[in-house]
């Protein structure tokens, strides 16, 4: 057993060396080890074949080190590995696409808070058993086509707290088992109409705290199992372009956050879901070029990149151009009591799923690596109401395993000592 480690055999053969100030993977790790805990050290490099002798290894924790480089063959020979935690290694920045090849039994991979700027082609190739992929709080700007194509058993994909600006057509191809997709706190301005085509089992989609002004309902159509949708804290344009989304939300049977309008000014702060169809008229004048839902070639429908309803001959275009009424009462940043809940002024009683602020929370001890607000915008503080609570897996046995999700903020949790401790 390496000097800084503790080794024991029951109930699993374990080599445990956490927070020992180790600067390298120790030599002499017992070959029979089924679990290796190396978290919280000062390891900066994982050389090739570091664990090759440990053929029975199922759990490897290398989180909270100072990893800057992982050799492509670092995990060679670990055919039985099920859980690999590399999170909290902010200097890592990139991972060789061959690093995880051969890990055919891997079911959980933690790569959150690793400073990742891109996902190289084929990075997740062959990880057919993977169920949980943690990529949150990195610096990812794009989702390359077919990145997750081989992950047919993936159920949870955490991509929040990155710098992703669009969701292209093939970003999520192959994710036929995906239950939960977290894309909040990014810079997403565009979602391709076919981006979610393979996500027929998706139950939870978080898109709050992005840069969406519109969302093609064609993208939502394949989401037959969707139960929880969060769209708050986006600059929604509630004019004729929002009619399809409005109609989809009226029919949606699941739980959804508020969808607060940014434009036109007369509807600012109002919830799209609670507007009447005839509120959604004309074309709001934006303070800059209109960004279409998807930047593709011009069509007969949208010859100028503008929806048909916004073209000069559109019958209802004038209503938004008239002098607007004052912005609606109700602060877009305050939670609202849904109809049927307790009357104003009476905050007691049960809290319901739509009655509170939701999003990035103040006071996190370890904020995300990246400030994920669009450039020039203020941080959300207390974003618009989303669901009060996050109902998670539909399983009712209360066993969370990897299943449960907390609320919006990111980071390592808490702010140290409590009052009175």
């Amino acid at each position: 057993c390496p000097g800084a480690c503790v080794c024991y055999n029951e109930p699993k053969v374990t080599t445990s060396c956490p927070q020992q100030g180790l600067q390298a993977v120790p030599v002499g790790i017992p070959a029979a080890s089924q679990r290796i805990f190396l978290h919280g050290n000062r390891i900066s490099h994982v050389p090739a074949a570091s664990f090759r002798a440990c053929r029975n290894l199922t759990i490897l924790w290398l989180h909270s080190n100072v990893l800057a480089r992982i050799d492509a063959a670092a995990f060679t020979g670990l055919a039985l590995l099920e859980q690999l935690d590399l999170s909290d290694n902010a200097q890592l920045r990139s991972v060789d696409p061959a690093t995880f090849h051969g890990l055919g039994r891997l079911h959980t991979l933690h790569l959150d808070r690793c400073g990742l700027q891109e996902l190289g082609p084929g990075l997740f190739r062959g990880l057919a058993a993977l169920q949980y992929l943690y990529l949150q709080d990195n610096a990812l700007q794009a989702l390359p086509d077919d990145t997750f194509r081989d992950l047919g058993n993936l159920t949870h994909l955490f991509l929040h707290g990155n710098r992703i600006s669009s969701v292209p057509e093939r970003a999520f191809r192959g994710l036929h088992s995906l239950d939960r997709l977290l894309l909040h706190q990014n810079r997403v301005a565009h979602v391709h109409p076919h981006a979610f085509r393979d996500l027929g089992r998706l139950m939870t989609l978080y898109l709050f705290a992005n840069n969406l002004s519109a969302l093609p309902t064609e993208a939502l159509a394949p989401l037959r199992a969707l139960q929880y949708l969060r769209l708050n804290d986006n600059p929604w344009v509630c004019d004729c372009r929002a009619r399809p989304l409005w109609a989809w939300l009226q029919k949606f049977r699941g739980s959804s956050s508020e969808v607060p309008c940014s434009l036109p000014q007369r509807l600012a702060g109002r919830d799209l879901k609670r507007l009447a169809a005839n509120d959604l008229q004309g074309c709001a004048v934006a303070t800059g070029p209109y960004h279409p839902i998807w930047t593709g070639r011009a069509t007969d429908e949208e010859p100028l990149g503008l929806p048909k309803c916004c073209q000069p001959d559109a019958a209802d275009k004038a209503s938004v151009l008239e002098p607007g009424r004052p912005a609606s009462a109700g602060n877009a940043l305050k939670g609202r009591v849904p109809p049927g809940d307790s009357p104003p002024g009476n905050g007691s009683g049960p809290r319901h799923i739509n009655d509170s602020p939701f999003g990035t929370l103040p006071g996190s001890a370890e904020p995300p690596l990246t400030a994920v607000r669009p450039e020039g915008s203020e941080p959300p503080g207390f974003p618009t109401s989303g669901p009060r609570r996050r109902p998670g897996c539909s399983r009712k046995n209360r066993t969370r395993s990897h299943c449960r999700l907390g609320q919006a903020g990111s980071g390592g949790g808490g702010t140290g000592d409590s009052e009175g401790s």
Epitope: S356, G392, R398, T399, R400, H402, A408, G413, T415
Partner: antibody, heavy 125, light 107 residues
């Protein structure tokens, strides 16, 4: 700075009820998942109940089911724990605590990271 | 309910020693375990969550590891202020359950 400020100590007769408050500052109550834990003199920690953010409901330990009620007043950011039909073995310090998991997204972070100072409830005839 | 069993129930060690406390769950809880420190007359303080994640502000001499059913809290280079009772808690499902506690005394 996050704080949970609890109401003061009370002495109660057997059969009576007690309602302990836990005022949140630094956050709004609707952002948090609050749980209650008690500790009898010289004994260990015992979870009583709290908000389950997975199922959007308040859950209780079986032992206290029917005797304990957890409520919130979001207008004052105060959580309450009411325990009825008190008996001498309910003499304990009652703590409210914040569930850290509610603040995080990956949710390998479930734990009680902030606690109130505790409220001593003595049940004696 | 998941039973949590800590051992030893009490331990006495000297400043500078290394102390290990173990916690065993009656069923697999993956890595969903927290450790708390409690000093007399005070509220518990979170040390470690998710079996191995060190809570902000907690000294590096505290470390946690384990998964499945067996977990350990290790205190390297024991300090006088570490005299306290330590509790594990499973956070995998409801009801949340605590171990019975381990009392650590400094010789």
């Amino acid at each position: 700075q996050m704080q949970l400020v609890q109401s003061g100590a009370e002495v109660k007769k057997p059969g009576a009820s007690v309602k302990v408050s836990c005022k949140v500052s630094g956050y709004t109550l609707s952002e948090l998942s609050i749980h209650w834990v008690r500790q009898a003199p010289g004994k260990g920690l015992e979870w009583m109940g709290g908000f389950d953010s997975e199922d959007d409901e308040t859950v209780y330990a079986q032992k206290f089911q029917g005797r304990v009620t957890l409520t919130d007043d979001t207008s004052t950011d105060t959580a309450y724990m009411e325990l009825s039909s008190l008996r001498s073995e309910d003499t304990a310090v009652y703590y409210c605590a914040r569930d850290l998991g509610y603040l995080t997204s990956g949710n390998y972070y479930d734990a009680f990271d902030f606690w109130g100072r505790g409220t001593m409830i003595t049940v004696s005839s | 309910d998941i039973q949590m069993t800590q051992s030893p129930s009490s331990v006495s060690a000297s400043v500078g020693d290394r102390v290990t406390i173990t916690c065993r769950a009656s069923q697999d809880i993956n890595r969903w375990l927290a450790w708390y420190q409690q000093k007399p007359g005070k509220a518990p303080k979170l040390l470690i969550y998710a079996a191995s994640r060190l809570q902000s502000g907690v000294p590096l001499r505290f470390s946690g590891s384990g998964s499945g059913t067996d977990f350990t809290l290790t205190i390297n280079s024991l300090q006088p202020e570490d005299s306290a009772t330590y509790y594990c808690q499973q956070t995998n499902n409801f009801p949340r359950t605590f171990g019975q506690g381990t009392r650590l005394e400094i010789k």
